[in-house]
Amino acid sequence: HTAAQDNCTCPTNKMTVCSPDGPGGRCQCRALGSGMAVDCSTLTSKCLLLKARMSAPKNARTLVRPSEHALVDNDGLYDPDCDPEGRFKARQCNQTSVCWCVNSVGVRRTDKGDLSLRCDELVRTHHILIDLRHRPTAGAFNHSDLDAELRRLFRERYRLHPKFVAAVHYEQPTIQIELRQNTSQKAAGDVDIGDAAYYFERDIKGESLFQGRGGLDLRVRGEPLQVERTLIYYLDEIPPKFSMKRLTA
């Protein structure tokens, strides 16, 4: 037997356990942490990836100014509750019964409360702004080449439909990628912008989630594009609800 052929792996998610125990003995992969079956032909949801991560051993000014309602993920890692489809549950709580509401990318959008806190619906993040600063290079990248390369990356590596990459802005050394996807625009089978952004973030950090693929080697006309810092802003369809205390802090 050829060992490599006679086993199961998940090309799009290395944080899985796979075996030929699906229907008809087909390969079936389950996410670590949750044990949920994942579709290896597309990206795994961010919620299941976070759960798996927690279970693992440990020209003119064109740049966009994030809206006052933009959220940044300051809370870092947590062990999320995911619904049967692998999406974040609207309400998340920790082991000490502290609860908060999250958006569709799992970022907190309310003050923390107790078990009585209600989160009526999972609010969709419809606009993601990925703000990158690249390492110094001999000269600036050509904007249209950079635009084309980043769009290609999101289309080919993350399988995100090109219509969801709204814009690529560049003002050396800052690059901004805007992803937009309303609830009405997202068809069945479409990759979610939140999942694509998370895979991209992990790639940029050198922590690729893809099985056996090399790390991300971003090049613009042969010139390496090396990112030295990343900031991601999340805009929800409904503005977040934080107390004034947080806003003035």
Epitope: D6, P11, S19, D21, G24, G25
Partner: antibody
């Protein structure tokens, strides 16, 4: 050694119901995907139902709604519940243990649907 | 449904001689997970089917190495280097890439 023994096949009238059993041994039943495959009198093979390790069930459209695959982990038995039987359901029914396909087959149990 | 077309319907072979059976599918059997869920089975007279080959070319345990499976996409072949008496019976191909899973109609291998 993997052993699969089917039983429950009888002569049944059209519209009737039947429950087939498959006693499994020689492997970890709870970790395995299992299926039922039938062979018509013309010797044509047809996939009938599958159950994955996570107990998700799968059926071809031709039997959906009339056939249910299930299992009893305590007794290591795979079942096939058949209702609203038709003459075209007449076949030898085989239970299989699955790994990249139908890896192991039982000896089969004969179901005849006739008035 | 994916149609699996086997040829020939009957194959008459002299013991010790090679034999080859073809199976063509109506659609590529390469799955999105990179695997090709294609099997060859043999049903000897009066017996249950027994799998010989899985994932196109992998031999099941206990299957003699005179059997070889090859192919990709839509075209697959089973070759027997030297036919022996125990190889007689009906050979079926199967696909598990697309739902519903489907079988070929069979190729009967008989002695000339």
């Amino acid at each position: 050694e993997v052993k699969l023994v089917e039983s429950g096949g009888v002569l049944v009238k059209p519209g009737g119901s039947l429950k087939l059993s498959c006693a499994a041994s020689g492997f970890t039943f709870s970790d395995s995907a299992m299926s039922w495959v039938r062979q018509t009198p013309e010797k044509r093979l047809e996939w009938v139902a599958s159950i994955s390790r996570g107990d998700d069930t799968y059926y071809p459209d031709s039997v959906k709604g009339r056939i249910t695959i299930s299992r009893d982990f305590a007794r290591n038995i795979l079942y096939l519940q058949m209702t609203s039987l038709r003459s075209e359901d007449t076949a030898m029914y085989y239970c299989t243990r699955d790994r990249f396909g139908f890896a192991y087959w039982g000896q089969g149990t004969l179901v005849t649907v006739s008035a | 449904d994916i149609v699996m077309t086997q040829s020939p319907l009957t194959l008459s072979v002299t013991i010790g001689q090679p034999a080859s059976i073809s199976c063509k599918s109506g659609q590529s059997l390469l799955d999105s997970d990179g695997k090709t869920y294609f099997n060859w089975l043999l049903q000897r007279p009066g017996q249950s089917p027994k799998r010989l080959i899985y994932l196109v070319s992998m031999l099941d345990s206990g299957v003699p190495d005179r059997f070889t499976g090859s192919g990709s996409g839509t075209d697959f072949t089973l070759k027997i280097s030297r036919v022996e008496t125990e190889d007689l019976g009906v050979y079926y191909c199967w696909q598990g890439t697309h739902f519903p899973f489907t079988f070929g109609s069979g190729t009967k291998l008989e002695i000339k």
